[in-house]
């Protein structure tokens, strides 16, 4: 008795974060024995789409010519071979930006910070939002994700960084999101350049000195120090 068919690989090109109106292609790669590919979208009738494999039959393409709110969400794919359906792929989260106006990102007390000191990045939205997301250019994933509790919406979220080291320097943007869908994000804020100046020896912070991670923001999510100023907001994706 053969074991279960291996799960396929699911990915999106040019990426999984797509601006409204732009095109995106979802790829599902299985095995050479695949006869059909199926794409399911969470909370949508299954299958969301079916495609015949492209030669040499080990993958299929699902095209979205113009990204809209309807396409944002969580996807899984399967393939069918002569012995049946595969296990589901790991999920792909397709996020759309441009759903809301851009928030404003600023640094307190200043975007010019001395190594070893503290800085807080402040993401502000003129309308109430329930999720704020901070990203750093060339980082693999969001640094921090603050979501309000009990549906209480906020106009801002604070992202404290302490102690600051050279790895914190760089270009940041933030997004905001409404409770309608966590797969719908605002336009990105204008970029904020955080400039870290200071000592020649600039060691990365150790976990014993603060709750910042020992690795820098490029390596894993940055944990904030202290409590989130707005009690309605709690941390996610840490």
């Amino acid at each position: 008795q053969a074991g279960p068919l291996p799960k396929p690989t699911l990915w999106a090109e040019p990426g999984s974060v797509i601006s409204w109106g732009n095109s995106v292609t979802i790829w599902c790669q299985g095995t050479l024995e695949a006869r059909e590919y199926r794409l399911d979208k969470e909370e949508s009738p299954a299958p969301w789409d079916r495609q015949n494999p492209l030669e040499p039959k080990n993958k299929a393409r699902f095209s979205i010519p113009s990204m809209t709110e309807d396409y944002a969400g969580r996807y899984r794919c399967y393939y069918r071979s002569p012995v049946g359906w595969s296990q589901p792929s790991d999920p792909l989260e397709l996020v759309m930006t441009g759903a809301y106006s851009k928030p404003t990102l600023s640094a307190l007390p200043s975007p010019l910070v001395t190594s070893g000191k503290s800085v807080t990045l402040l993401c502000q939205s003129r309308s109430p939002m329930d999720t704020f997301l901070l990203i750093k250019e060339r980082a693999a994933h969001p640094l921090l994700h603050l979501r309000s509790e009990h549906g209480a919406q906020q106009h801002q979220a604070e992202f404290p960084m302490s102690p600051v080291t050279s790895v914190h320097g760089g270009t940041y943007r933030c997004f905001s999101s409404h409770g309608f869908s966590h797969y719908l994000l605002s336009h990105p804020s204008d970029p904020l350049e955080l400039i870290v100046s200071g000592s020649l020896e600039d060691p990365r912070p150790s976990p014993t000195r603060s709750v910042s991670t020992a690795a820098g923001p490029e390596d894993q999510p940055l944990m904030p120090t202290g409590s989130v100023p707005h009690s309605g907001l709690r941390r996610h994706w840490e």
Partner: antibody
Framework: EVQLVESGGGLVQPGGSLRLSCAAS?????????ISWVRQAPGKGLEWIGS?????????YYATWVKGRFTISRDNSKNTLYLQMNSLRAEDTAVYYC???????????WGQGTLVTVSS | DLVMTQSPSTLSASVGDRVTITCQAS??????LAWYQQKPGKPPKLLIY???TLASGVSSRFSGSGSGTEFTLTISSLQPDDVATYYC????????????FGGGTKVEIK
């Protein structure tokens, strides 16, 4: 030239309806702005009616006194914003402005306004 | 509820005088406050944004200050061209607001 131009004002009877338009030129309503409708009754101050977010979802917020009588919408293909006004009353007589919220959160661009008179 | 209270409602001063208008928010609005000048038959004109930043093309006679709940618009030396009504406005947009503007201050020359 970057501008907003309102139209659709005029004389309407109490209980009637009117749709005002706000045509944007020189910038896209689907870029990252909020647009508000503001009115000013003769000899009175500025009164916020409501706002629409230019993001694709198009969230709208209204002043508490609106109570469902007014609706803000947009047509991105025409780069135009609308204010649908129903169950109009004499006290709705005013100059109606549309205005854009800039990156600085202030109303940095205003139309010239259109006069709505509610009278029998 | 977030309410903007502006004072005084009318102000009469002489040419060259220093004139101050205040705006009080019922809760903190950080620095998201703007000031406008409006002349009869015209739309409002943005003077100051983010509490203290002068809008493009506005005379340096105008200045703004404050943060949190207390804000001030100052005209350093009143000129005849400054006769107008001035409004403050907070930058937030949400569904529990009656208005985003203060009640206005009419500035006249003695």
């Amino acid at each position: 030239e970057v501008q907003l131009v309102e139209s659709g004002g005029g004389l309407v009877q109490p209980g009637g309806s009117l749709r005002l338009s706000c045509a944007a030129s020189g910038f896209s309503l689907s870029s990252s702005y909020w647009i508000s409708w503001v009115r000013q009754a003769p000899g009175k101050g500025l009164e916020w009616i409501g706002s629409i977010d230019s993001g694709s979802v198009g969230i709208t917020y209204y002043a508490t006194w609106v109570k469902g009588r007014f609706t803000i919408s947009r047509d991105n293909s025409k780069n135009t914003l609308y204010l649908q006004m129903n169950s109009l009353r004499a006290e709705d007589t005013a100059v109606y402005y549309c205005a854009r919220h800039g990156d600085n959160w202030a109303l940095d661009l205003w139309g010239q306004g259109t006069l709505v008179t509610v009278s029998s | 509820d977030l309410v903007m209270t502006q004072s005084p409602s009318t102000l009469s001063a002489s040419v060259g005088d220093r004139v101050t208008i205040t705006c009080q928010a019922s809760q903190s609005i950080n620095s998201w406050l703007a000031w406008y000048q409006q002349k009869p038959g015209k739309p409002p004109k943005l003077l100051i944004y983010k509490a203290s930043t002068l809008a493009s093309g506005v005379s340096s006679r105008f200045s703004g200050s404050g943060s949190g709940t207390e804000f001030t618009l100052t005209i350093s030396s009143l000129q005849p061209d400054d006769v107008a009504t001035y409004y403050c406005q907070h930058g937030y947009i949400r569904g529990d607001l009656d208005n985003v503007f203060g009640g206005g201050t009419k500035v006249e020359i003695k």
